[in-house]
């Protein structure tokens, strides 16, 4: 009913991993480097990164009716953010601080996306936009904004999985 092949996701596992993602996203945010807060208003990320919106079926009723839509949206977002965290935005200069949890965050995003899409199953894939290469002077701001957007995304995903674990688990 929820993942390809008609099976449900491991709601409890997804809940635990999404909660871990929330913690990691919040701990990573201040550690990406000094951020001049005047930069915050430069550009909006809203059109450039995935968001979970009203029509995505992630409300309790939508999850009851068919959680497939919501889970596919979450999966797409996880893949997008996983790609971002593995890109030169985070791997290039200036280097991340040694104690940055971005590596763990990257691995956890991949782990949750794999839980949602087991081996051999495939969502109808929505094209993930290709990223322009980042330049060194752009990266601090990009890291800051991506992690801030990711916080919002995983917070919604965690609520979805908490609801699923409580009400939709077999």
């Amino acid at each position: 009913r929820a993942v390809p092949g008609g099976s449900s996701p491991a709601w409890t596992q997804c809940q635990q991993l999404s909660q871990k993602l929330c913690t990691l996203a919040w701990s990573a945010h201040p550690l990406v480097g000094h951020m001049d807060l005047r930069e915050e208003g430069d550009e909006e990320t809203t059109n450039d990164v995935p968001h979970i919106q009203c029509g995505d079926g992630c409300d309790p009723q939508g999850l009851r009716d068919n959680s497939q839509f919501c889970l596919q949206r979450i999966h797409q977002g996880l893949i997008f953010y996983e790609k971002l965290l593995g890109s030169d935005i985070f791997t290039g200069e200036p280097s991340l601080l040694p104690d940055s949890p971005v590596g763990q965050l990257h691995a956890s995003l991949l782990g949750l996306s794999q839980l949602l899409q087991p081996e051999g199953h495939h969502w109808e894939t929505q094209q993930i936009p290709s990223l322009s290469p980042s330049q060194p002077w752009q990266r601090l701001l990009l890291r800051f904004k991506i992690l801030r957007s990711l916080q919002a995304f995983v917070a919604v995903a965690a609520r979805v999985f908490a609801h699923g674990a409580a009400t939709l688990s077999p």
């Epitope: 550009e43 059109n47 450039d48 936009p129 322009s132 290469p133 330049q135």
Partner: antibody, heavy 123, light 106 residues
Framework: EVQLLESGGGLVQPGGSLRLSCAAS????????MHWVRQAPGKGLEWVSV????????WYADSVKGRFTISRDNSKNTLYLQMNSLRAEDTAVYYC????????????????WGQGTLVTVSS | DIQMTQSPATLSLSPGESATLSCRAS??????LAWYQHKPGQPPRLLIY???HRATGIPARFSGSGSGTDFTLTISSLEPEDFAVYYC????????FGQGTRLEIK
């Protein structure tokens, strides 16, 4: 219509200083990173420097690092290039340039250019 | 830094002919390459971005192709106003320009 107008060029002796300005109009200046690009006589284009939209971050070509300072005044829609310890090889037409794309994941190609201002370093 | 090499340095052709300009990067730049036209006393003009996308207002006779390290700008039927210097620019890592190709009337 986007307009960029450079000024401040002229003749200066080696070791001297000069400040270039670029007055911008026709777009929301404070939302765009801005660049300086130069062309020496008979030579190709060379990227010089960039400044982030608020002025919080800057970057320079190795050839000018430590001698040139890029800055901006968003209240005046103006970009600056302070050039110190000038050398003969800094002789060039200096252009200010704006990217073709805004947004977060932007590509660094130049859609809009000023007419340029000539800097001549000679004794 | 990534070096950009353009060839030929000078290309002599007549109006109506087709021009092929080459640009080679010292390492892969993906498709993060732009082409500019530059005439004396004027600022450079963006022709092509992302290797093959024509900029706004650029005539269809200009086309770009290539990826990785080898790129081509083709002008299908030269107009008198096309004779100028052409530069390629990579933006995969920092920003570097080629040394230019001068397209002159034969």
């Amino acid at each position: 219509e986007v307009q960029l107008l450079e000024s401040g060029g002229g003749l200066v002796q080696p070791g001297g200083s000069l400040r270039l300005s670029c007055a911008a109009s026709g777009f929301t200046f404070s939302r765009y990173e801005m660049h300086w690009v130069r062309q020496a006589p008979g030579k190709g284009l060379e990227w010089v420097s960039v400044i982030s939209p608020s002025g919080g971050r800057t970057w320079y070509a190795d050839s000018v690092k430590g001698r040139f300072t890029i800055s901006r005044d968003n209240s005046k829609n103006t970009l600056y290039l302070q050039m110190n310890s000038l050398r003969a090889e800094d002789t060039a037409v200096y252009y200010c340039a704006k990217l073709g794309t805004g947004g977060v994941f932007k590509s660094t190609y130049f859609q809009h250019w000023g007419q340029g201002t000539l800097v001549t370093v000679s004794s | 830094d990534i070096q950009m090499t353009q060839s030929p340095a000078t290309l002599s052709l007549s109006p109506g002919e087709s021009a092929t300009l080459s640009c080679r990067a010292s390492q892969s730049v993906g498709t993060y390459l732009a082409w500019y036209q530059h005439k004396p006393g004027q600022p450079p003009r963006l022709l092509i971005y992302d290797a093959s996308h024509r900029a706004t207002g650029i005539p269809a006779r200009f086309s770009g192709s290539g990826s990785g390290t080898d790129f081509t700008l083709t002008i299908s039927s030269l107009e008198p106003e096309d004779f100028a210097v052409y530069y390629c620019q990579q933006y995969r890592s920092l920003i570097t320009f080629g040394q230019g190709t001068r397209l002159e009337i034969k």
